[in-house]
Amino acid sequence: MAVTACQGLGFVVSLIGIAGIIAATCMDQWSTQDLYNNPVTAVFNYQGLWRSCVRESSGFTECRGYFTLLGLPAMLQAVRALMIVGIVLGAIGLLVSIFALKCIRIGSMEDSAKANMTLTSGIMFIVSGLCAIAGVSVFANMLVTNFWMSTANMYTGMGGMVQTVQTRYTFGAALFVGWVAGGLTLIGGVMMCIACRGLAPEETNYKAVSYHASGHSVAYKPGGFKASTGFGSNTKNKKIYDGGARTEDEVQSYPSKHDYV
């Protein structure tokens, strides 16, 4: 039961995390105008991975997409790539993990297959979470660098009485959403990997005992899942039994009233 709970919780946490990664990737507030030097601005700027926006104090907002691909900074392209890879891996991981869930029965899928799928999805979630965290961190580093550079240049070349205040950008909400979402996906992935260990059958090896009964030979074979898949070419006079040990969790083949699909 603990393994099912761990797997289910891992799936839910990863699902929330990936939803967060998608949300962060789509959000426009990756960087927002720093209002420290100009708290009374009537025009507020913020930027995302795909477009930049200007919100006027009158309430009107205008957003413009980055319609160039080659003209964009390499770092921004890298962040986009990391986030997209994170989303794709996470989506595949979710798909795999749905079929790996113990509470969902698909045909006569063996527990070893479910264990492998759980591990695969867990690894995918971990990589997805790392991609998101890396993407957000690269962007944050880019912001910090630009922030201090623009601070240094803020009042240079003023010349006369006219003051030109350079717009500085600071961390936007999307960065925090991305960090949290990446962390959740990572945690979900780790939980899936932990659940995989509980799902994997313990292969207890017994000595093969063969005895002859009247007219029929019955072989008791060791090897857990390897003994038979149920689709073997069994001869008429020979029965093959699964002699493997089952864990407490594996006894529950069908969903109980506490497991929801």
Epitope: A42, E62, T164, V165, Q166, T167
Partner: antibody, heavy 118, light 113 residues
């Protein structure tokens, strides 16, 4: 069509308060900031403050040192501007104006003359 | 506060002539986010409230004749009336729409010679 109709002229004594109203029609009153701008005789226009009728959020010009209070009654689509501790230099025409794209004032009331005299 | 300085104080032109007036701000009104200048021009005729002419330094409001045009960027702006008509006699104000408090210029009075 958009219309902003202001209350009539007022004569006040120094130290008193005045409350000017501005009734809006022809648009969604709650969705646009309403501003108050005054113009003293022979002087430039001076922005006093604004209110967002949707939630009552306000912004004021600090030069008025807290003497201005802007309120609204959304059910009546009316904005109000109250100026307290009146002085003779507060004698001016007071306008309400709708805030629009580009942070400009696209529609103005006809103006309310407030005279402060002892 | 941003100080808006208009010049000249008054301008006398003949009908059909070109009228040009200037507005200078103490700070740049150019927003880097959308590369727009947050400067507005108004026309005020005697006994009337101001009327919006141009916003974003060069965008004409709907219904404004195309003889009115705005130009400039950063701190220096110009309003041009290409061919002055009798109904253009008014005071023209520029406004900072970039930073609170929103401030206005002292105005330029346009008269007919």
């Amino acid at each position: 069509q958009v219309q902003l109709v202001q209350s009539g002229a007022e004569v006040k004594k120094p130290g008193a308060s005045v409350k000017v109203s501005c009734k809006a029609s022809g648009y969604a009153f709650s969705n646009y900031w309403m501003n108050w701008v005054r113009q003293a005789p022979g002087q430039r226009l001076e922005w006093m403050g604004q209110i967002y009728p949707g939630n009552g959020d306000t912004k004021y010009n600090g030069n008025f040192k807290g003497r201005v209070t802007i309120t609204r009654d959304t059910s009546a689509s009316t904005a109000y501007m109250e100026l307290s501790s009146l002085r003779s230099e507060d004698t001016a025409v007071y306008y309400c104006a709708r805030y629009y794209r580009g942070n400009c004032f696209d529609y103005w009331g006809q103006g309310t003359l407030v005279t402060v005299s002892s | 506060d941003i100080v808006m300085t208009q010049s000249p104080d008054s301008l006398a032109v003949s009908l059909g002539e070109r009228a040009t007036m200037n507005c200078k701000s103490s700070q740049s009104l150019l927003n880097s986010g959308n590369q727009k200048n947050y400067l507005t021009w108004y026309q005020q005729k005697p006994g009337q409230p101001p009327k919006l002419l141009i916003y974003w330094a060069s965008t004409r409001d709907s219904g404004v004749p195309d003889r009115f045009s705005g130009s400039g960027s950063g701190t220096d702006f110009t309003l041009t009336i290409s061919s002055v008509q009798a109904e253009d006699v008014a005071v023209y104000y520029c406004q900072n729409a970039y930073t609170y408090p929103l401030t206005f210029g002292g105005g330029t009075k346009v008269e007919i010679k």
